[in-house]
């Protein structure tokens, strides 16, 4: 057959569905490779092909469409499993074409098992929730597409093994769950599981998401530089080595890019010639507030590197700051011979 | 289409133990709940317990607890109810339902067991 | 374990008639509910889960509702092909608890 424009395997989307749930699964090409949509190329003549290489198998073959109660099926640009087995497993190919063009892309396709209290290979998404922030909303997700408006599912919500009922705060109120106000406790996997019926057969959609609990905006303050602070000094003789620790605290803010940097006369480490190596750590709190620390080093500090401005910075979303550190060169302490020497004026 | 198949009849004398299978199939077996649940004669449906076949966790009623084991097998996709030391009060039909949750989607036909000197 | 109660415990009604069954917790089961219809000799079949969730299959005619402690079950019209018993079925908290069973006839 003539050429045709392969984009691979797309591993970005690594899809991942529960054995014995539907599955609906868009053809990433309309998503992510080409700039029209699917309604676009169908009117245009193209055709929608999708085939599949089940898993540890090279061979390619078409999918079959004539399984009982069509359980896999194409809609438009999609492919549905009502439901999914697990020897669905595999890399699944759509190719889009015509007499004169053709596209293709393929993705892996991982059907799990889950144990009695949903743990499973699945990867989950992590939703933030602000620690005492009032009333806060997770809502079950990738539902949508997969039965009409006018059926109303029942949604069951779990925290771990157990259904979430008679709990202080938090409550279930349909696709959402209410967090009246959010702690510690309640990080954790939530699990959302929607029963609907089609067609004379129920279904189950089951997902997973991981709640942590981080510090609220209303406390985020601006970086505060623990060390270098007034209270130390960093005195040493040429030849000794030179350690500065420059601990900063950052306040949990979402999305913000958290910076530590050293200058030494104003430069960069990485643009003068010192010998100087920065060493980073970092850890986080409980509500994910951030602590950094960069140590500066100097094998050995000459009474040139003593005399210069060792500076620290930290930025955050909430402002920046700076702190210099007290860097001396040791006072060498009197020799008693050369003082006697001096003092009865010896030559 | 989900289906729950049961062993047959058993007759038991005092104090033995019995068995019964409840081979499924028409879904997933290892990733839902098999409850059992029985029903003497003339009488309501009283809830044993619950196995999950795919990891083995199992619930069982207070009552049971002790003399009722559930087991699964996932290579033929069968689930087992043994009840032992048995009296004549154990004399039901016993059901196996399948769970995806909590509720009881589907059930097998029943299994009669009569305990009798 | 959670004491389910229902009532009647057994009713007759005309073919059309509007068939309600009660269903009453010892304790709030937060909708937990599910009702079952088990025909002479066969097994109990799910009609509705989560006190008014319709299993698939079961026709429109049946519906459920309550809260809190209190739940019912509706038959808008009975059919002759109604003539059960009928089980409602806690699953908030283990052990599961059925109530004792409402016997529907035909007059």
């Known amino acids: 057959s003539e050429r045709c424009d392969d984009w691979g395997l797309d591993t970005m989307r690594q899809i991942q569905v529960f054995e014995d749930e539907p599955a609906r699964i868009k053809c990433p090409l309309f998503e992510h490779f080409l700039k029209f949509n699917y309604s676009t190329a169908h009117s245009a003549g193209l055709t929608l092909i999708w085939y599949w290489t089940r898993q540890d198998r090279d061979l390619e073959e078409p999918i079959n469409f004539r399984l009982p109660e069509n359980r896999i099926s194409k809609e438009k640009d999609v492919l549905w499993f009502r439901p999914t087995l697990l020897n669905d497993t595999g890399n699944y190919t759509c190719m889009l074409r015509n007499t004169t063009y053709c596209s293709k892309v393929a993705f892996p396709l991982e059907v799990v098992q889950k144990d009695s209290c949903f743990n499973s290979p699945m990867k989950l998404p992590v939703h933030k929730l602000y620690i005492e922030y009032g009333i806060q909303r997770i809502t079950c997700p990738n539902v949508d597409g997969y039965f009409p408006s006018s059926v109303k599912p029942t949604i069951t919500w779990y925290m771990g093994c157990y259904k979430i009922q008679n709990f202080n705060n938090v409550i279930p109120e349909g696709m959402n769950l209410s967090f009246l106000i959010a702690l510690i406790s309640n990080n954790g996997n939530y699990t959302c599981v929607v029963t609907y019926p089609e067609n004379g057969r129920t279904f189950h959609l089951t997902r997973t998401l991981t709640v942590k609990v981080v510090g609220s905006p209303k406390n985020a303050v601006p970086p505060v530089i623990h060390s270098p602070n007034d209270h130390v000094v960093y005195e040493k003789e040429p030849g000794e080595e030179l350690l500065i620790p420059c601990t900063v605290y950052f306040s949990f803010l979402m999305d913000s890019r958290n910076e530590v940097w050293w200058t030494i006369d104003g430069k960069k480490p990485d643009d003068i010639t010192i010998d100087v190596t920065i060493n980073e750590s970092i850890s986080h709190s409980r509500t994910e507030d951030e602590t950094r620390t960069q140590i500066l080093s100097i094998k050995k500090v000459t009474s040139e590197d003593l005399k210069r401005s060792y500076v620290c910075h930290a930025r955050s979303a909430k402002g920046e700051v700076a702190k210099a550190a007290k860097v001396k060169q040791k006072v060498p302490a009197p020799r008693y011979t050369v003082e006697l020497a001096c003092g009865f004026g010896a030559t | 289409q989900v289906q729950l198949v049961q062993s047959g009849a058993e007759v038991k004398k005092p104090g033995s133990s019995v068995k019964v299978s409840c081979k499924a199939s028409g879904y997933a077996f290892s990733s839902s709940w098999m409850n059992w649940v029985r029903q003497a004669p003339g009488q309501g449906l009283e809830w044993m317990g619950r196995i999950y076949p795919g990891d083995g966790n199992t619930h069982y009623a207070q009552k049971f607890q002790g003399r009722v084991t559930l087991t699964a097998d996932k290579s033929t996709s069968t689930a087992y109810m043994e009840l032992s030391s048995l009296r004549s009060e154990d004399t039901a039909v016993y059901y196996c339902?399948?769970?995806?949750?909590?509720?009881?989607?589907?059930w097998g036909q029943g299994t009669l067991v009569t305990v009798s000197s | 374990d959670i004491q389910m109660t229902q009532s009647p415990s057994s009713l007759s009604a005309s073919v059309g008639d509007r068939v309600t069954i009660t269903c009453s917790a010892s304790?709030?089961?937060?909708?937990?509910l599910n009702w079952y219809q088990q025909k002479p000799g066969k097994a109990p079949k799910l009609l509705i889960h989560y006190t008014s969730g319709l299993h698939a299959g079961v026709p429109s005619r049946f519906s459920g509702s309550g809260s809190g402690t209190d739940y019912t079950l509706t038959i808008s019209s009975l059919q002759p092909e109604d003539v059960a018993t009928y089980y409602c079925?806690?699953?908030?908290?283990?052990?599961?608890?059925f109530g004792g069973g409402t016997k529907v006839e035909i007059k």
């Open positions: 339902g399948e769970g995806y949750l909590d509720p009881m989607d589907y």
């Open positions: 079925q806690q699953y908030s908290i283990l052990p599961w608890t």
């Open positions: 304790q709030g089961i937060n909708n937990y």
